[in-house]
């Protein structure tokens, strides 16, 4: 599995999607959890309703909620309120009995907000993550940009 | 009972070469990443590089790159370390340490080093 | 190279002490920083990782904290057996990279 970036705003929302294969995973309880190290047992933080015809209602687990598109095939994730500590690998999974197949891998990073002027000499413009050199980068920032205001991170 | 284990103290003449070795017990070492760690007498610790035992994937520090050659043998559960030319810069304690890689790793298992000691 | 500074490089406290370590990168490493604690003859052994988080068995007066490019060490009511070397390491990207070290000493 190639990993997918996803960049978020400190203090902001980010949304993480997953698209699967609907009928591949017709039936199936999704779940987001949080991996310990690239090689690393992967700890559950939330999953899908366990009815999985309601699968479509946001579940919460303290800052993160999932939700399933189960006919569309995309599973999202939200973190609210984006922290530091958020930062780190990831996997969307779809669940069969005891096993998990992985949909996606995700690396989060979390950019200081650049309206935060407690942080304007310490803001993080991203250049190459040398572990995932090969990793597609979201950007996925929910804040909408003010009136004459440079978008960030730049974008190359 | 988790452990890395590492080969004894090496007294080895300067332009020689020398070979540590690692093994792993209670763990595979397949499941881990092997990295080297330099220490000079009386120094800080310099990070040499790591190898995937999973598939022979190694990343150099740059300074290390053509000094180590990093190698793995499942097999054995064994990871070793290979330095060429040595000099006097080269007299350190080595370190092998095991984790789960970048991006918060709990895992965290170390040697008790390797003594290599460069003579003129 | 992200560069890892290191301060101070030797301390002298008291026991009973808070003693306080930081940790400033050269770039923006999110949290991946580790703090390893060093005795002689020993091998390091790891003490925080993900900038603020306890690993299996440190006693719970060593903490750490920051994000971004600065980070601290701290420990509350020094012990003879914190009498060591303290070293903080990078993860953002390799070469991983450690800071010079800093010893602690009872006065």
């Known amino acids: 599995h190639n990993t997918t970036v996803f960049q978020g705003v400190a203090g902001q929302s980010l949304q993480v999607s997953c698209p699967y294969d609907s009928m591949k995973h017709w039936g199936r309880r999704k779940a987001w959890c949080r991996q310990l190290g690239e090689k690393g047992p992967c700890q559950r933080v939330v999953s899908t309703h366990n009815l999985w015809l309601l699968s479509f209602l946001r579940r919460w687990n303290g800052s993160t909620a999932i939700t399933d598109d189960t006919l569309g095939g995309t599973l999202t994730i939200t973190l609210r309120n984006l922290q530091p500590h958020d930062a780190g690998l990831y996997q969307c999974q779809s669940l069969h009995g005891s096993e998990a197949d992985t949909l996606r891998k995700v690396l989060v990073e979390v950019l200081a907000d650049p309206l935060d002027h407690r942080d304007a000499g310490d803001l993080w413009f991203p250049g190459e993550s040398e572990s995932f050199e090969d990793a597609h980068v979201e950007h996925s920032i929910s804040r909408s940009l003010l009136e004459g205001e440079i978008p960030f991170p730049p974008t190359s | 009972e988790v452990q890395l284990q590492q080969s004894g103290a090496e007294l080895v003449r300067s332009g020689a070469s020398v070979k540590l070795s690692c093994t792993a017990s209670?763990?595979?070492?397949?499941?881990?990443?092997i990295h080297w760690v330099k220490q000079r007498p009386e120094q800080g610790l310099e990070w040499i590089g790591w190898?995937?035992?999973?598939?022979?994937?190694?990343k150099y520090a740059p300074k290390f790159q053509g000094k180590a050659t990093m190698t793995a043998d499942t097999s054995s559960n064994t990871a070793y370390l290979h330095l060429s030319s040595l000099t006097s810069e080269d007299t350190a304690v080595y370190y092998c340490?095991?984790?789960?890689?970048?991006?918060?790793?709990?895992?965290?298992?170390w040697g008790q080093g390797t003594s290599v000691t460069v003579s003129s | 190279d992200i560069q890892m500074n290191q301060s101070p490089s030797s301390l002298s406290a008291s026991l009973g002490d808070t003693v306080t370590i930081t940790c400033h990168a050269s770039?923006?490493?999110?949290?991946?920083l580790s703090w390893y604690q060093q005795k002689p003859g020993d091998h390091p052994k790891l003490l925080i990782y993900?900038?603020?988080n306890l690993h299996t068995g440190v006693p719970s007066r060593f903490s750490g904290s920051g994000s971004g490019t600065g980070f601290t060490l701290t420990i509350s009511s020094l012990q003879p057996e914190d009498i060591a070397t303290y070293y903080c390491?990078?993860?953002?990207?390799?070469?991983?990279?450690f800071g010079g070290g800093t010893k602690l000493e009872i006065k």
């Open positions: 340490h095991a984790d789960h890689g970048n991006y918060g790793s709990t895992m965290d298992y």
């Open positions: 209670g763990f595979s070492i397949e499941d881990f990443y």
């Open positions: 390491q990078q993860g953002q990207t390799y070469p991983r990279t």
């Open positions: 190898i995937d035992p999973e598939n022979g994937d190694s």
């Open positions: 770039q923006h490493i999110n949290v991946w």
């Open positions: 993900k900038a603020s």
